[in-house]
């Protein structure tokens, strides 16, 4: 049996292809015959799924040119706030345990985009853990007017997350140090494994596998909402939007954004992956009479898609009656 | 042709365990993956584990985790499907079944002609 | 695991009609599907791949269609040989998973 390949590398040159490359083993074992390639779909990231985006001022931003991930600081005006009474000097209010534990899961989430795509090289993934599959209770489906707390990581269980495991799948090489695969995900890691096999492979088996693990390049596109937002009315002044999830986005969809107004598209609402996984959509609420339009745009791990075409609806005045009623 | 043959019909006790063949004839083994795919009576297919005779490399479902073992032998071009802590639900035909090509792993376009396995007290 | 649905559960058709059956993922699987045709004591044959493809020596009266969540095979005219229990397949995650059957009986 031969030994391991050697330097085993992989780059990515589109959405869906890895390029492979390696080098013979040092101890081929006999006449070198071919090499089996073996690649698997890596799960992402369990917090990815359960971090809340909607409620940081902050989005992951893709470099491009080194593979990293920054984190992009909305900033607003600053509040001046007042601590010491009406005239006394203004000092740092003492921090809630809410604020304490907000700081450490900001502190998480940073080191996860950090270290998230570092120089495009990957160390091999521990064991991951079985979870608890959780309900959240009481999830609202606005997140404009919820205060940042603990709650920023969702318990929720995606079922993407859950368990999820991917094939193998095989291709073999002959002759050659180098291999393209195809068909791939935009935006996705993959482990690749590389077996050396001699004249001897189909009796006495080929070598163990050198592997390296890579990440596709995104699709352009590939995060735009495919089909059309529609809407129902609901009570008390709101309405349902729906749309469809982008059925292969790049790497995975963190979270939607709606514009909407009535005459100009001024409001914005956040909808998290957890809340769309939920219900299919967002409701908005405290809506006054009249005509909107709204767009909807997802952000995945690479950026944003395209906003969707406004979708038109309309908000009922109450008649006297039911003012009356209520 | 390629022809996959399985041992014949087993009748086991509960907790106890079996073993089912699956060899190759007519054409190359080692290189192929081999699964294994179990259907009970008037019920559909479950697929339970494979393995990559040449690299030797198994891989099972999570349900089956920890009491199937799937191994093979080169010199004889067989698969073996080894199942334990039997239970009266493990009553089925098993199937070996060959992936149709390396590079369309997964579908199955070879199959043995399967091997009723019954548990019974 | 991805949970594949199909339906109807039987069918009844005439030799000679079309009959058209539907398989639903409870997740998307893109195109990673496959239609196998499994006769009373017989081990099932492959059909159709990558939710088109027809497998070698598959008589052109067979073929698939769908990506995502929805399929479809369609047998464009019966012959008697068709009627048999058709599956389909996921083999986009771990575990492998079949559909529960769809029974295509004489009318």
């Known amino acids: 049996v031969p030994s391991i390949p050697l330097d085993v590398l992989s780059a990515s040159n589109s959405s869906s292809q890895l390029i492979v490359k390696w080098n013979p083993p040092s101890l081929p074992n006999g006449n070198l015959s071919y090499y089996i390639v073996r690649w698997q779909r890596q799960p992402q990231d369990g917090y990815l799924y359960r971090h809340n985006y909607c409620s940081k001022d902050k989005i992951p931003i893709r470099k491009y040119a080194d593979g990293t991930i920054d984190i992009e600081e909305v900033t607003e005006n600053p509040k001046t706030e007042v601590c010491g009474g009406e005239k006394g000097p203004c000092c740092a209010c003492p921090k809630t345990e809410a604020e304490k534990q907000a700081e450490k899961e900001e502190a998480e989430y940073r080191k996860v985009f950090e270290n998230f795509l570092h120089n495009s090289i990957f160390v091999p993934r521990p064991e991951r853990k079985r979870r608890d599959v959780m309900q959240v209770a009481n999830t609202t489906m606005s997140s404009r007017s919820r205060n940042t707390t603990a709650a920023d990581t969702y318990n929720i269980t995606d079922p993407e997350e859950l368990e999820t495991e991917y094939p193998f799948f095989e291709s073999r090489v002959d002759n050659k140090e180098r291999t393209v695969i195809s068909n791939l995900r935009p935006f996705t890691l993959y482990r690749i494994d590389i077996h050396s096999c001699n004249h001897e492979a189909e009796k006495l088996g080929c070598s163990a596998s050198n592997f390296v693990f890579a990440r596709t390049m995104p699709a352009e596109g590939a995060d735009d909402i495919p089909g059309p937002v529609t809407w129902e009315p609901r009570p008390e002044n709101s309405i349902f939007l729906k749309w469809p999830e982008p059925e292969n986005p790049n790497g995975l969809i963190l979270m939607y954004e709606i514009k909407y107004g009535s005459q100009v598209e001024d409001q914005r609402e956040c909808v998290s992956r957890q809340e769309y996984r939920k219900y299919g959509g967002a409701k908005l609420n405290r809506l006054n009479p009249g005509n909107y339009t709204a767009r909807i745009q997802a952000t995945s791990l690479s950026g944003n898609g395209s906003w969707t075409d406004p979708v038109f609806f309309y908000v009922q005045a109450k008649t006297g009656y039911e003012n009356f009623i209520h | 042709q390629v022809q996959l043959q399985q041992s014949g019909a087993e009748v086991k006790k509960p907790g106890s365990s079996v073993k089912v063949s699956c060899k190759a004839s007519?054409?190359?083994?080692?290189?192929?993956?081999i699964s294994w795919v179990r259907q009970a009576p008037g019920q559909g297919l479950e697929w339970m584990g494979r393995?990559?005779?040449?690299?030797?490399?198994?891989n099972y479902a999570q349900k089956f985790q920890g009491r199937v073992t799937i191994t093979a032998d080169k010199s004889t071009s067989t698969a073996y499907m080894e199942l334990s802590s039997l239970r009266s639900e493990d009553t089925a035909v098993y199937y070996c079944?060959?992936?149709?090509?390396?590079?369309?792993?997964?579908?199955?376009?070879?199959w043995g002609r399967g091997t009723l396995v019954t548990v019974s007290s | 695991e991805i949970v594949m649905t199909q339906s109807p559960a039987t069918l009844s058709v005439s030799p000679g009609e079309r009959a058209t059956f539907s398989c639903r993922a409870s997740?998307?699987?893109?195109?990673?599907l496959a239609w196998y045709q499994q006769k009373p004591g017989q081990a099932p044959r492959l059909l159709i791949y990558?939710?088109?493809n027809r497998a070698t020596g598959i008589p052109a009266r067979f073929s698939g269609s769908g990506s995502g969540t929805d399929f479809t095979l369609t047998i464009s005219r019966l012959e008697p040989e068709d009627f048999a229990v058709y599956y389909c397949?996921?083999?986009?995650?771990?575990?492998?998973?079949f559909g529960g059957g769809t029974k295509v009986e004489i009318k």
């Open positions: 079944a060959r992936d149709h090509r390396f590079d369309y792993a997964w579908y199955f376009d070879l």
């Open positions: 007519g054409g190359t083994f080692s290189s192929y993956a």
């Open positions: 393995i990559i005779p040449i690299l030797g490399i198994a």
């Open positions: 997740q998307s699987v893109g195109s990673n």
């Open positions: 990558d939710a088109s």
């Open positions: 397949q996921q083999r986009s995650n771990w575990p492998l998973t």
